[in-house]
Amino acid sequence: SQVSQNCHNGSYEISVLMMGNSAFAEPLKNLEDAVNEGLEIVRGRLQNAGLNVTVNATFMYSDGLIHNSGDCRSSTCEGLDLLRKISNAQRMGCVLIGPSCTYSTFQMYLDTELSYPMISAGSFGLSCDYKETLTRLMSPARKLMYFLVNFWKTNDLPFKTYSWSTSYVYKNGTETEDCFWYLNALEASVSYFSHELGFKVVLRQDKEFQDILMDHNRKSNVIIMCGGPEFLYKLKGDRAVAEDIVIILVDLFNDQYFEDNVTAPDYMKNVLVLTLSPGNSLLNSSFSRNLSPTKRDFALAYLNGILLFGHMLKIFLENGENITTPKFAHAFRNLTFEGYDGPVTLDDWGDVDSTMVLLYTSVDTKKYKVLLTYDTHVNKTYPVDMSPTFTWKNSKLPNDITGRGPQ
């Protein structure tokens, strides 16, 4: 139903959903701190622009009595319950920040007349693509999929001279929320990734994965998985791996690979790590101390959500335009604004663009090195290391099908 918005007469409110079920197990206090830090910045920006207005956030907590799994499994109803709570209290702001779970975002978008913008730190799944009033500030699955297809097709680099058209995908159901939806997108038979590949099989058991590593009859040399190095080690251990196997480890929200003192363990030599370009260095921020890299990205997305709202509010107020209109609700896309950590670019559908980085382990230095970068905004790959010191034969990535190319 239509809810009146606290969003006029020089007073602008942000509704922040503080859900017990979240994409990342982050203390809500840290997210509150991130939001409050963002509010201070927005107030400063509006003041600088000569706009004498008030901007506040209302934190909407769920009671946690029913929906208490802590992860995203029971988030669908929690999101709707919170919306009902907002509706009953007549406390909707100009914008809704949260939820982060794909299930809840999808359902809330479906079940409400959204005349206000929704900003999410998460909602990674394909079911949240192309939503007209939804903005996502952490890389969604679609962006990963487009990189993988682009990389698979690439065959004109010194270190990759074969197009690939096959892959195994390891997905055992214990993944984090981001990984769950990334792998879900790769598994989906109707997705772009599946459409572009000739062969794709999902490995669901540890033993299936382990067997493939030395199976002479395997149908692909490439295995995609999602998680950190420790996750891979638990699965692979020190098992022997055929020399033409390539493991693609998707670990987007982890910048530890770039730290000076990090040495790549031996079990990472057959692995290419896909991560985001480093720089989410919230080291001097009150809300970010003692946060893991993933949680830092999550808190940063909340903060940037506030800055995005401030950016749009400033533009509309300077142009003398109304905030409680469909035009405002649909405006949070196809733009760049100054985020906490640098410029943030949103694509035509309101999804954050970023630079993805593919790393390899140098056999000489045992360090992670940048092989190439990929700009999600233009869907383009940029080679960085033209003569990588790979473990693979001739310092080239093997063909994806055993029996062809370097073995």
Epitope: Q47, L282, L300, E338, G339, G342
Partner: nanobody
Framework: QVQLVESGGGVVQPGGSLRLSCAAS????????MDWYRQAPGKQREMVAT???????TYTDAVQGRFTISRDNAKNTVYLQMNNLKPEDTAVYYC?????????????WGQGTQVTVSS
């Protein structure tokens, strides 16, 4: 009224060091990242370094590894530590702050401080 005041320029020998400061009004300093630019005689103004609100910094290739930008939130001041200076670093250095304008630079400029590297 937005104010940016640079200081710390001077004459230094090649290989020497200087530390530039830029004191800003608190409402600008707390709301935006800040940049250092420089303009050598007869040349276009070029960006040297940027520091974002988080403290993350980026540099132009010419100064990478020699210059360090930092911010002191208590003093509303941004610094540019310049080491291993070269004659080609000779220029007027400007602090740039505030929202980005249509021309992709920030709205407010300081008055500039002269850096001369010469033996």
């Amino acid at each position: 009224q937005v104010q940016l005041v640079e200081s710390g320029g001077g004459v230094v020998q090649p290989g020497g060091s200087l530390r530039l400061s830029c004191a800003a009004s608190s409402n600008i300093f707390r709301a935006y990242g800040m940049d250092w630019y420089r303009q050598a005689p007869g040349k276009q103004r070029e960006m040297v370094a940027t520091i974002w609100l988080s403290g993350r910094s980026t540099y132009t290739d010419a100064v990478q590894g020699r210059f360090t930008i930092s911010r002191d939130n208590a003093k509303n001041t941004v610094y540019l530590q310049m080491n291993n200076l070269k004659p080609e670093d000779t220029a007027v250095y400007y602090c740039n702050a505030g929202p980005t304008t249509a021309s992709s630079v920030r709205q407010y400029w300081g008055q500039g401080t002269q850096v001369t590297v010469s033996s």
